[in-house]
């Protein structure tokens, strides 16, 4: 089989008739040197996933459900290639599972127990999979066979499909339970029309269900989604208040050497030619012989998905943990309202350091898990391998369009009431070395740069973000002549100027020299023209602060600050002469940890805050000799967000707008996977 | 209440060995692990190796690989075994566990 051939999985005699057809027509229309298909057939989609894990096929469609199959080891698959639906202008890859119920019904997803339910169908993936599987650890026990706990934890159901003789109750609100359109509360639109009725309390849909069924806003108003946070939410916010954000068909192929780049090189190349409206010969999206044979008949073309996204990045941890649940069957010992352990994330060996100390000294409260840079910790706290940890506002931005929530935040000024007053942020500046007395912020071309990391807010979404305005291109690392920016690409002449030794130069943590507020400042004392910190940098850094042997002889006059308007100002004018203002570093979680986080941290603080006088002899949660791990060293504490509880909120739509600007310069492969998750 | 007894250290030349101990008087000793710390002079004391609960070690950079921190709950001791010592590593150590004051605390001096 020559390189260049995707071979696709077929699981029926007709899918492998479309299969030869796919493969004879795309022979037809692509040059010789392109990707072509060859067929293999097997008996089902789990013997589909088995063979493209073991190299005999390379590429399989599959539902939401298998895509969990395929991605458990041993298989180890991962979606390369969506299907969408609706428009090319408004892609589809989407639906959302929902809990729909009547306005004036007044309960939340945690008192659903005695409640009468309406389900599309047993076992169908909105309507009793993500539901069931989320509700799994509220059922009474024994929890098998699933049906009878279900039906002793609502009142009454209709689920269809159930078997009506041993689970009575699970037909209770639709005598017979048919399987079929025959059973008026069949399927989306019958287990929609069961709560309209009265007969049920709430119904298990997804979210496109109360638009097909309900034209007239006057009439949706009077219905509320259910939000796994135990809020409500009007139907049209299905995006912020769902129990999962479900794929509908994927293509999926091996992790490693899985030809993901010639599949879609396929595919693209398919949908260009025997896409929607495009061939009467053949069609891509139709099934004379069947139905939705390789692809689903009803969608319109694929999109690639981002390399960063793993399976259990693509499906979502609600989804994960409802699927998980049900196939597993496994819940704590008694679900108790005490708080599980916060699982922190700790970047590179100092900072697990750090964070294994706090570990052994919060007698169990916190847990430490390590990542190599703060995207992957933010992956991590996604998928619940972690829980939390504290981040600079450009990746706030990046954690909130990944669905976190920040929680708490750093305060860096001393107060009366500091764990209520959040602060409005500190302040983004450009340093340089006084003796460098020609250097202006209008001057900055050719020069070299020293940035605390790729994607941080004083380091660079300030700066470059005001630079690309001025410059209108992304090519920051023509625009100086060397620098260094961990996290930039390592071939970077924005690498060049990095200390890290082998693998660890540029890379965006502490293995890095240059890494950080600190090291941004290193960088410049050692080699650099320029250093974007935070005001407080040089002061910290100076006058004996940080016993280092490169800094132990620094001096804060040495210094200047570069203003926007071409002049420069003393150290200590930062109020006066600064890029802007940027939002304090926030912690950030999952909107389920959310209340135990704060709780949590509140506690750890009041053991191990600023009210620890003695660093020397008892951890002190917000020292690290100027190192930064885990939370800045001049954090005097946590406090409370109050209402700015979104990463909107917190940051600001100034903030958020800037970064947003930016986004066309960004290499951010995380960001990039959840803006396809939720664009 | 639990008190804590580091003993073992002593002045070793470059290259040699030590192993230091840290006994703890009372019930419920090391249950959410145990840290060895060490403080050279004019410095500020920093933390070496810990041992969780669990068996989970870790170490501060500059000693991996050299130093090897280990338990035995039956009698209520964590050691510290300390090889290729370099006269970095001069200081004075000490173990902790949570709620439990630091000790004397052992010297260790390494002679180039």
């Known amino acids: 089989v020559p390189d260049k051939t995707v071979r696709w999985c077929a699981v029926s005699e007709h899918e492998a008739t479309k299969c030869q057809s796919f493969r004879d027509h795309m022979k037809s229309v692509i040059p010789s040197d392109g990707p072509s298909v060859a067929c293999v057939k097997k008996a089902s989609y789990l013997d589909c996933i088995r063979a493209i894990a073991a190299n005999e096929a390379d590429a399989v469609t599959l539902d939401a459900g298998l895509v969990y199959d395929a991605y458990l080891a041993p298989n180890n698959l991962k979606p390369v290639v969506a299907e969408f639906y609706g428009s090319k202008e408004d892609p589809q890859t989407f639906y959302y599972a929902v809990a729909v119920v009547k306005k004036d019904s007044g309960f939340q997803m945690n008192q659903l127990r005695g409640k009468k339910s309406c389900h599309t169908g047993l076992g169908r993936s909105a309507g009793w999979n993500i539901p069931i599987g989320l509700l799994y650890c509220d059922l009474p026990e024994p929890r098998k066979p699933l049906e009878k706990a279900v039906a002793n934890f609502f009142s009454g159901s209709c689920a269809p499909c159930a078997d009506g003789t041993d689970f009575p109750q699970l037909c209770q609100l639709c005598p017979g339970c048919g399987c079929s359109t025959l059973n008026q509360y069949f399927g989306y639109s019958g287990a929609f029309k069961c709560l309209k009725d009265g007969a049920g309390d709430v119904a298990f849909v997804k979210h496109s269900t109360i638009f097909e069924n309900l034209a007239n806003k006057a009439d949706r108003d009077q219905y509320e989604l259910l939000c796994l946070d135990n809020t409500r939410k009007p139907v049209d916010e299905y995006k912020d208040c769902h129990l999962a954000q479900v794929p509908s068909h994927t293509v999926v192929a091996r992790s490693m050497g899985g030809k993901e780049d010639l599949i879609w090189e396929l595919l693209n190349q398919a949908q260009e030619h025997f896409g929607k409206d495009k061939s009467k010969e053949f069609q891509l999206f139709s099934s004379p012989h069947g139905k939705d044979l390789l692809f689903k008949d009803s969608a319109h073309g694929f999109l690639k998905v981002p390399p960063r996204m793993d399976a259990k990045m693509y499906l979502g941890y609600e989804y994960v943990t409802a699927i998980r649940n049900l196939r597993e069957g496994t819940c704590p010992e008694a679900p108790t309202d005490e708080c599980k352990p916060v699982k922190w994330c700790a970047l590179s060996h100092h900072e697990r350091l750090k964070c294994d100390e706090w570990s052994v000294n919060s007698v169990g409260k916190i847990e430490c898990v390590s990542a190599e840079t703060t995207e992957d910790c933010i992956a991590k706290i996604m998928n619940g391998e972690a829980d939390a940890m504290s981040l600079d506002g450009g990746f706030v931005y990046i954690a909130g369009k990944c669905g976190l929530v920040p929680v708490l935040a750093e305060n860096y000024n001393k107060s009366d009431n500091c764990e209520d007053t959040p602060e409005a942020g500190y302040f983004a500046i450009a340093v340089v070395k006084k003796s460098a007395s020609d250097l202006t912020w209008d001057n900055l071309k050719g020069k070299k740069s020293c940035h605390t990391a790729v994607g941080r807010t004083a380091g660079w979404n300030i700066p470059m973000g005001l630079l690309y305005n001025k410059i209108n291109h992304c090519r920051f690392d023509e625009f100086f002549s060397e620098g260094c920016a961990p996290g930039s690409k390592k071939d970077s002449s924005l690498c060049k100027l990095c200390m890290g030794s082998g693998l660890n130069l540029c890379e965006p943590n502490n293995k890095e020299g240059y890494y950080g507020y600190t090291g941004a400042f290193r960088c410049l004392v050692e080699k650099g023209d320029v250093a974007f910190v935070k005001h407080q940098t040089v002061p910290q850094n100076t006058g004996g602060k940080n016993p280092d042997p490169w800094a132990k002889n620094l001096n804060e006059k040495d210094y200047e600050l570069l203003c926007l308007d071409g002049t420069r100002k003393p150290v200590e004018e930062y109020a006066n002469c600064h890029l802007a203002r940027a939002p304090n570093h926030a912690v950030v979680t999952r909107k389920d940890k959310e209340a135990c986080v704060h709780k949590i941290l509140r506690q750890q603080q009041h053991l191990f805050g600023s009210n620890v006088t003695d660093c020397s002899g008892n951890f002190c949660l917000f020292r690290s000799e100027t190192k930064d791990l885990l939370f800045r060293d001049d954090t005097v504490c946590l406090a409370k967000l109050h209402d700015r509880n979104t990463y909107e909120k917190y940051l600001g739509e100034e903030y958020v707008k800037a970064v947003g600007n930016l986004r066309k310069c960004s290499t951010s492969s995380l960001l990039e996977a959840c803006t396809f998750r939720r664009p | 209440e639990v008190q804590l007894v580091e003993c073992g250290g002593g002045l070793v030349q470059a290259g040699g060995s030590l192993r230091l101990s840290c006994v703890a008087s009372?019930?419920?000793?090391?249950?959410?692990?145990v840290i060895w710390y060490r403080q050279a002079p004019g410095k500020q004391r920093e933390l070496v190796a810990l041992i969780k609960s669990d068996g989970y070690t870790n170490y501060r950079e500059s000693v991996k690989g050299r130093f090897t921190i280990s338990r035995d709950d039956a009698k209520n001791t964590v050691w510290l075994q300390m090889n290729a010592l370099e006269p970095e590593d001069t200081g004075v150590y000490y173990c902790k566990t949570p709620g439990v004051p630091f000790g004397q605390g052992t010297q260790v001096t390494v002679s180039s």
């Open positions: 009372g019930s419920g000793f090391g249950i959410n692990g």
